[in-house]
Amino acid sequence: SGTTNTVAAYNLTWKSTNFKTILEWEPKPINQVYTVQISTKSGDWKSKCFYTADTECDLTDEIVKDVKQTYLARVFSYPAGHVESTGSTEEPPYENSPEFTPYLETNLGQPTIQSFEQVGTKVNVTVQDEWTLVRRNDTFLSLRDVFGKDLIYTLYYWKSSSSGKKTAKTNTNEFLIDVDKGENYCFSVQAVIPSRRTANRKSTDSPVECMGHEKGESRETGHHHHHH
């Protein structure tokens, strides 16, 4: 069954980074509007983005209720100007999305180096802990709160004067690395969930931060650069 002059949505795609989750689809509507429903395996479908002319729907509020659940969404097509009719039994055309498990599938956002601090031949590099829209007891959780030890960071660092990179790993948000005295270093970090075996295992690299610029502080040289 279907509704006159409406076409079913297609190419339903989940776009999700740090649990901010948008469902996108095609086609751009001509004389039709869409309503989205989302459910866990319970089949308790919840309607969102009622009669929208957009081809995306923010489902973050629903998926953050339990990021380890698996969700399915479906997009219904209605004629433009559609008004909900209690007498109508005709089912509008719809399409199902792929299944989506936020904990396993959300992309890791680009991390940011919060600060670095040199003390002698040691440098402490701190990665900024990103806030997510996942809540527990009315408090927003950070990426580390959600993933715990499933999330690690890889630090790439090199002397400003050379291209040879070294790496370090941590399952916290801090690195303590050995450096050569009197040398300036550059740093970049990447978020990784080692247990994932898919393309979304790693984030993109953070912007590069170098010693002698505005990010850290060096007790070695007497220059103090406080992070914002």
Epitope: S42, D44, E91, E95, N96
Partner: antibody, heavy 118, light 106 residues
Framework: EVQLLESGGGLVQPGGSLRLSCAAS????????MAWVRQAPGKGLEWVSA????????YYADSVKGRFTISRDNSKNTLYLQMNSLRAEDTAVYYC???????????WGKGTTVTVSS | DIQMTQSPSTLSASVGDRVTITCRAS??????LAWYQQKPGKAPKLLIY???SLESGVPSRFSGSGSGTEFTLTISSLQPDDFATYYC????????FGGGTKVEIK
């Protein structure tokens, strides 16, 4: 181990009523939609009804609409099918099944036999 | 309602044979199709969902393919335990089953 066990089948006269039960174990019952599927003797499978995990959404095949009522008690991990105004063509083995999203059936019970005859 | 038509209704085959069962939908159902196996006196068992996803614990000799209106269930090398009746089921719009395909010993 995930298990579903139907009960309540039997012989009933046309026009009579019967209530089937399905006891679930081994999974979080309220997290899954559930369904009833039947199979008449020597015939294929026919979907009868489905219900969401909360019990808030119910669906029926046209052949049973208005006569059958699906329900669930999540505190007892039990699914029900109340069958009224039974007809000879309702004679079948009735299976309860775990149904993710209410879409397909990934675990089935062994079935209970309902015979409608005078 | 969406009608599902299976063919053949009966299939005679020998152990080791490659067996293919076809299921056609009366309108496009994308990939929203499941396959079940049923033995006499037993409950059905899920083999495949979403047209080609193998259910956990199901032997890899079973595979599903197709989208839109035409689907196939393939058993790459028929085993003695595979003689049974197979059903397709669409879940694009409510639920309907195909009429079944009985795989019997040749």
């Amino acid at each position: 181990e995930v298990q579903l066990l139907e009960s309540g089948g039997g012989l009933v006269q046309p026009g009579g009523s019967l209530r089937l039960s399905c006891a679930a174990s081994g999974f979080t019952f309220s997290s899954y939609a559930m369904a009833w599927v039947r199979q008449a003797p020597g015939k294929g499978l026919e979907w009868v009804s489905a219900i969401s995990g909360s019990g808030g959404l119910t669906y029926y095949a046209d052949s049973v609409k208005g006569r059958f009522t699906i329900s669930r008690d999540n505190s007892k991990n039990t699914l029900y099918l109340q069958m009224n105004s039974l007809r000879a063509e309702d004679t079948a083995v009735y299976y309860c099944a775990k149904a993710p999203y209410g879409y397909y059936m990934d675990v089935w019970g062994k079935g209970t036999t309902v015979t409608v005859s005078s | 309602d969406i009608q599902m038509t299976q063919s053949p209704s009966t299939l005679s085959a020998s152990v080791g044979d490659r067996v293919t069962i076809t299921c056609r939908a009366s309108q496009s159902i994308s990939s929203w199709l499941a396959w079940y196996q049923q033995k006499p006196g037993k409950a059905p068992k899920l083999l495949i969902y979403k047209a080609s996803s193998l259910e956990s614990g199901v032997p890899s000799r079973f595979s599903g393919s197709g989208s839109g209106t035409e689907f196939t269930l393939t058993i790459s090398s028929l085993q003695p335990d595979d003689f049974a009746t197979y059903y397709c089921q669409q879940y694009k719009s409510y639920i309907t089953f195909g009429g079944g395909t009985k795989v019997e010993i040749k």
